[in-house]
């Protein structure tokens, strides 16, 4: 049978020929009668055999990491007979490992992100090195990890390559770190080989900084003419955090006057001070408000960094604007009796300069020839007034500052002209009527009414009478109806067209004014020839008949 030991050949042997071992048949008595042969991959090129002795040699340098074992076949032949002494047999040559490979980090580049202020022990990343040497051969591939750069902030677990935080880091001081990790084989013993890798560790932001005002004091100005909603200036805080963690909200902490507001421009992160209520320089020209700023998003666990909001004080100076005069009232209503003499007092208006300089005021009345106004605001009549022509005057009073004539204010002035009893009542229309020749006594021939151009505080009341002459002439009589009308009646029977074709009756109408006024009004009565039916046949004036619509035949 075959006799051999297990064959080992160290890798990387530099000698030209290295004896590995001997293949032998136990039938070989050493008289060189057998011939040994080597077959298979590597036979003749990598390995050779001494045909006489069966000694095997490696004639090439071997690399275990390239090939760790060779499977060869051996034959032994009797030289004399040429026949196989033993059956062909397979045998193995193992390439034994030497520490000729350093550890390599295969997953480079390494990059990790970890939140700033993470506590000690927080896992950052695991790095893994690989060693091509034989892990089963001693310590050639047993690795140990260590930190070459990154203390005191990071540490690495020696056997796992797990990188952990060993000291809290503040992104606002440094936002990224390069850590260098070394992997050594031979568990770090002498003669070990090493490899290194760099790990870029970036710190992600957490909201550990509150916003702080750039200035502890701001100065802004606002014109007293500025409308509400006007932006009067900006204030600015800075936050060392980034992104969402730097978003802030401004607000007012103190403003007794409730005159201002602050809104946040979320694009620029500025606070915009706006006017909430109109300001008046003459009332208050200096304001002080305290503003505060807070982050928009603060997780509960980070509230400890945001206990007291940053504040700033804002002084706001109101700028004076020359304002037009201000009337005491929005409009004035005065009363004056008609027929009062020219120069009569009507009323007094008053305007003042609201500004501190208190300019004197000049007054004028627009479009009026009836009234005058002096520099004291006293209004008088410049003509006699007639209520029956104009009962109301709608005017405009203008006040102008003496020191700045461009500063003008106008308000309405209403003057009511009060009535005096200066008009007697008179017929409401022209009355012209007729009486038939055959009219009987007491026949109603006309109802009359009156009007009075005066205004009556109570209802107008008119009194109707015939004049003294007509009272004595008994052809007609009058009855006052007590309702501002009266009826004219015949006071006799029969009239004669030929003798007296027309009567002119004087009627006195008095009003109830104090003093009472009376007018004399003439009623014309035509005598007509009437038929039995009462239809008019002939009157002296055909026009009258026509105008009265009577039939003429």
């Amino acid at each position: 049978g075959w006799v051999w030991n297990q064959f080992f050949v160290p890798e990387e042997m530099n000698t030209t020929s290295h004896h590995i071992g001997q293949l032998r048949s136990d039938l070989d008595n050493g008289n060189n009668s057998f011939q040994y042969k080597l077959l298979g991959a590597g036979a003749g090129s990598t390995f050779i055999i001494d045909e006489r002795t069966g000694d095997i040699y490696a004639i090439q340098k071997l690399d275990r990491e390239e090939r760790s074992l060779y499977i060869l076949r051996a034959q032994v032949i009797d030289i004399a007979t040429g026949r196989a002494v033993e059956p062909e047999s397979e045998f193995v040559i193992k390439v034994s490992d030497i520490n000729d490979n350093e550890p390599k980090f295969l997953d480079e580049p390494y990059e990790a992100i970890v939140p700033e202020m993470s506590p000690e022990g927080t896992l950052v990343i695991q790095v893994t090195a690989s060693d091509a040497d034989d892990p089963s051969s001693g310590n050639n591939a047993r690795l140990l990890y260590s930190l070459l750069q990154g203390q005191p902030y990071f540490s690495v677990e020696p056997t796992t390559g797990v990188i952990r935080i060993s000291s809290k880091m503040d992104r606002e001081l440094q936002d990224e770190y390069w850590v260098i990790i070394q992997a050594k084989d031979m568990i770090g013993q002498p003669g070990a080989l090493s490899g290194t890798t760099s790990v870029l560790i970036k710190l992600s932001d957490v909201n550990d900084n509150k916003p702080i005002f750039k200035e502890s004091l701001y100065r802004l100005t606002v014109s007293e003419s500025a409308p509400t909603g006007t932006s009067i200036g900006t204030i600015m805080a800075y936050d060392n955090d980034i992104g969402e963690n730097a978003e802030m909200d401004y607000s007012i902490e103190e403003d007794d006057s409730q005159t201002f507001d602050i809104i946040t421009n979320h694009e620029t992160q500025e606070g915009i001070v706006i006017l909430k209520k109109k300001v008046d320089f003459e009332h208050q020209n200096h304001y002080g408000i305290r503003a505060k700023v807070k982050n928009h998003h603060v997780p509960e666990q980070l509230m400890k960094y945001h206990t007291e909001a940053s504040t700033t004080f804002i002084k706001i100076q109101v700028e004076d604007v020359d304002e037009p005069p201000l009337f005491l009232l929005p409009y004035y209503v005065f009363e004056v009796f008609e027929e009062t003499p020219q120069g009569s007092f009507v009323g007094v208006v008053s305007a003042t300069d609201p500004d501190n300089r208190k300019s004197p005021i000049r007054y004028s009345i627009t479009r009026s020839k009836v009234f005058n106004i002096n520099d004291n605001g006293t209004i008088t009549t410049s003509n006699s007034l007639d209520r029956e022509i104009s009962a109301w005057y709608n005017l405009s009073i203008t006040a102008t500052e003496k020191y700045n004539i461009e500063q003008i204010s106008s308000i309405p002035l209403y003057v009511q002209v009060l009535n005096i009893n200066d008009h007697a009542p008179e017929f409401s229309q022209y009355y012209e009527t007729y009486v038939c020749e055959n009219a009987g006594s007491g026949q109603v021939i006309q109802t009359i009414s009156a009007v009075d151009r005066d205004e009556s505080i109570e209802e107008h009341h008119f009194y109707f009478n015939l004049s003294v002459e007509d009272t004595n002439n008994s052809s007609f009589t009058i009855i006052d109806n007590q309702d501002n009308t009266a009826v004219i009646l015949t006071n006799r029977t029969g009239f004669n067209l030929q003798e007296e074709p027309v009567f002119y009756i004087s009627i006195l109408i008095a009003d109830n004014g104090i003093p009472s006024l009376t007018s004399t009004n003439t009623l014309t009565i035509h005598v007509c020839d009437c038929g039995d039916s009462g239809s008019t046949q002939t009157c002296q004036y055909q026009e009258l008949v026509l105008s009265m619509g009577f039939k003429t035949e």
């Epitope: 004091l217 100005t221 007794d256 003459e282 002080g288 004080f313 002084k315």
Partner: antibody
Framework: QVQLQESGPGLVKPSQTLSLTCTVS??????????WSWIRQHPGKGLEWIGY???????YYNPSLKSRVTISVDTSKNQFSLKLSSVTAADTAVYYC????????????WGQGTLVTVSS | EIVLTQSPGTLSLSPGERATLSCRAS???????LAWYQQKPGQAPRLLIY???SRATGIPDRFSGSGSGTDFTLTISRLEPEDFTVYYC????????FGPGTKVDIK
Amino acid sequence: QVQLQESGPGLVKPSQTLSLTCTVSGGSISSSGYYWSWIRQHPGKGLEWIGYIYYTGSAYYNPSLKSRVTISVDTSKNQFSLKLSSVTAADTAVYYCARDGSSGWYFQYWGQGTLVTVSS
Amino acid sequence: EIVLTQSPGTLSLSPGERATLSCRASQSISSSYLAWYQQKPGQAPRLLIYGPSSRATGIPDRFSGSGSGTDFTLTISRLEPEDFTVYYCQQYGSSFTFGPGTKVDIK
């Protein structure tokens, strides 16, 4: 600590112009948000504010003195000045310069004052 | 302009006593716009209180201010010998005006 020091003639003739300067030390006159005032005190009487100036040159005066007062600022010298024209004996007073506060318009820092007498 | 009236004109008290000084405005002012000053003879006024209850830097806590609208008060809880001097109130809302002063003297 901000300190203010008034300087100028102690005697001015009637109808002339009173001129005083206030020198600021321990702080910049150009500090944002602060106003620099002149205040006077007639002998044995109360205090009267004259006017103030901001480092930009923007000034505001007491309306009762406005027509006679000019306040100016020189940031390079850290000084501000008062000019009061057409003086009369009624302008005899101790004149103080002052700076307002960081939380309001009150007067936080004062100079020690300088007496100006108007007399012929 | 806003006129400030201080009362009493003179207040006679003994050391250790409580002093109450009044300042009245001719029209309502926001409490944030009133200050108190102390002035010793030959010296410039010194800010005591502003806004109207905040003590200025270095002012002892025996000094306190209060009030709103038109009526304001400076209180000195226990008078010390150095407190016997003149006190002025000042409004700084509408321009700047001072009260005529209250003199605190030793009884």
